[in-house]
């Protein structure tokens, strides 16, 4: 069974998938469509790297641009380094500026909804 066939079989169960499953799925050449990606849990999407999302979506990755203001894409973009987002060539904006450190202060983040940034 190839990645696309596998994806069709599991598509309806993906809404509640944890990050670990999404990371594993990104290695399967599934080419997830944006409609499915937008239904994923935000907390499961946030830890994914740019490379993992690129692999997860395959050719559909360019669809991130159209959804850059919608959750969970918007919240995911805020967690990525702008340099990494730029590698996609989609014109995505809102990533963490170059030279900033991201402090994973879970309490601060829980209160504000955004990571804590320290300037250069």
């Amino acid at each position: 069974m190839n990645g696309s066939e596998y994806f069709v079989k599991i598509q309806s169960f993906l809404g509640g998938a944890p990050t670990e499953d999404l990371k594993a799925l990104s290695q399967q050449n599934v080419s997830m469509d944006l409609a499915t990606f937008m239904k994923l849990r935000t907390d499961a999407v946030l830890p994914l790297t740019v490379a993992e999302v690129q692999k997860l979506l395959g050719p559909h990755v360019e669809g991130l641009k159209a959804e850059e203001r919608h959750r969970p894409v918007r919240d995911w973009i805020l967690r990525q380094r702008q340099d990494d987002l730029d590698t996609l060539g989609l014109g995505l904006q809102g990533g963490i500026p170059n030279g900033y450190l991201v402090l994973d202060l879970s309490m601060q983040e829980a209160l504000s909804g955004t990571p804590c940034l320290l300037g250069p």
Partner: antibody
Framework: EVQLQQSGPELVKPGASVKIPCKAS????????MDWVKQSHGKGLEWIGD????????IYNQKFNGKATLTVDKSSSTAYMELRSLTSEDTAVYYC????????????WGTGTTVTVSS | QIVLTQSPAIMSASPGEKVTLTCSAS???????LCWYRQKPGSSPELWIY???NLASGVPARFSGSGSGTSYSLTISSMEAEDAASYFC?????????FGGGTKLGMK
């Protein structure tokens, strides 16, 4: 056949509100965002905003913040746009249009609803 | 916001004539994020060309689209009566999404 059916023309008084329905049929409602566009003689086509039917997540053109409110009713595959505090500037044809999630173009447009604001 | 300026605003063409409509952006637009709509009088707009050069379903092959950066165009290789309509360009490269003012194309 994919269709976006909108209601007929509305004549409303200044200061009033109007809620325009857009009934979708012929496709999976939650696979497409619903965008709304204003067409007036003076300003041409203007994008108002959009809504994701899965999450009710909305994005508005800043110009229409406080003027338009977008909602959906998944059970009836209907999107709504409410316009409030209407003035003569709001006289226009309003279109709903579907946008495949992950694209930015509108591949099907609604029939359009003409809103005339006049005392 | 990105301003799209279409020219000419109004024009007419003879049957068989080659027609080119232009759309100029105030700042650069990624070509994937530029499309065109056609609108006949009294009707809703309809998607005509997407991602700069891809024809929407049912659009005749005499239509083509091209461009990059700030300059885009829609070309009709041989004008026909049914092509008389208004044509609007649209960008979704930046928020808010914007449209050009349109070109009203008539038949001579």
């Amino acid at each position: 056949e994919v269709q976006l059916q909108q209601s007929g023309p509305e004549l409303v008084k200044p200061g009033a509100s109007v809620k325009i329905p857009c009934k979708a049929s012929g496709y999976t409602f939650t696979d497409y965002n619903m965008d709304w566009v204003k067409q007036s003689h003076g300003k041409g086509l203007e994008w108002i905003g959009d809504i994701n039917p899965n999450t009710d997540d909305t994005i508005y053109n800043q110009k229409f913040n406080g003027k338009a409110t977008l909602t959906v009713d998944k059970s009836s595959s209907t999107a709504y746009m409410e316009l409030r505090s209407l003035t003569s500037e709001d006289t226009a044809v309003y279109y709903c249009s579907r946008r495949l999630i992950g694209t930015g173009y509108f591949d099907v447009w609604g029939t359009g609803t003409t809103v005339t604001v006049s005392s | 916001q990105i301003v799209l300026t279409q020219s000419p605003a109004i024009m007419s063409a003879s049957p068989g004539e080659k027609v080119t409509l232009t759309c100029s952006a105030s700042s650069s637009v990624i070509s994937t994020y530029l499309c065109w709509y056609r609108q006949k009088p009294g009707s809703s707009p309809e998607l005509w060309i997407y991602s700069t050069s891809n024809l929407a379903s049912g659009v005749p092959a005499r239509f083509s689209g091209s461009g990059s950066g700030t300059s885009y165009s829609l070309t009709i290789s041989s004008m026909e009566a049914e092509d008389a309509a208004s044509y609007f360009c649209h960008q979704w490269s930046n928020y808010p999404y914007t449209f050009g003012g349109g070109t009203k194309l008539g038949m001579k």
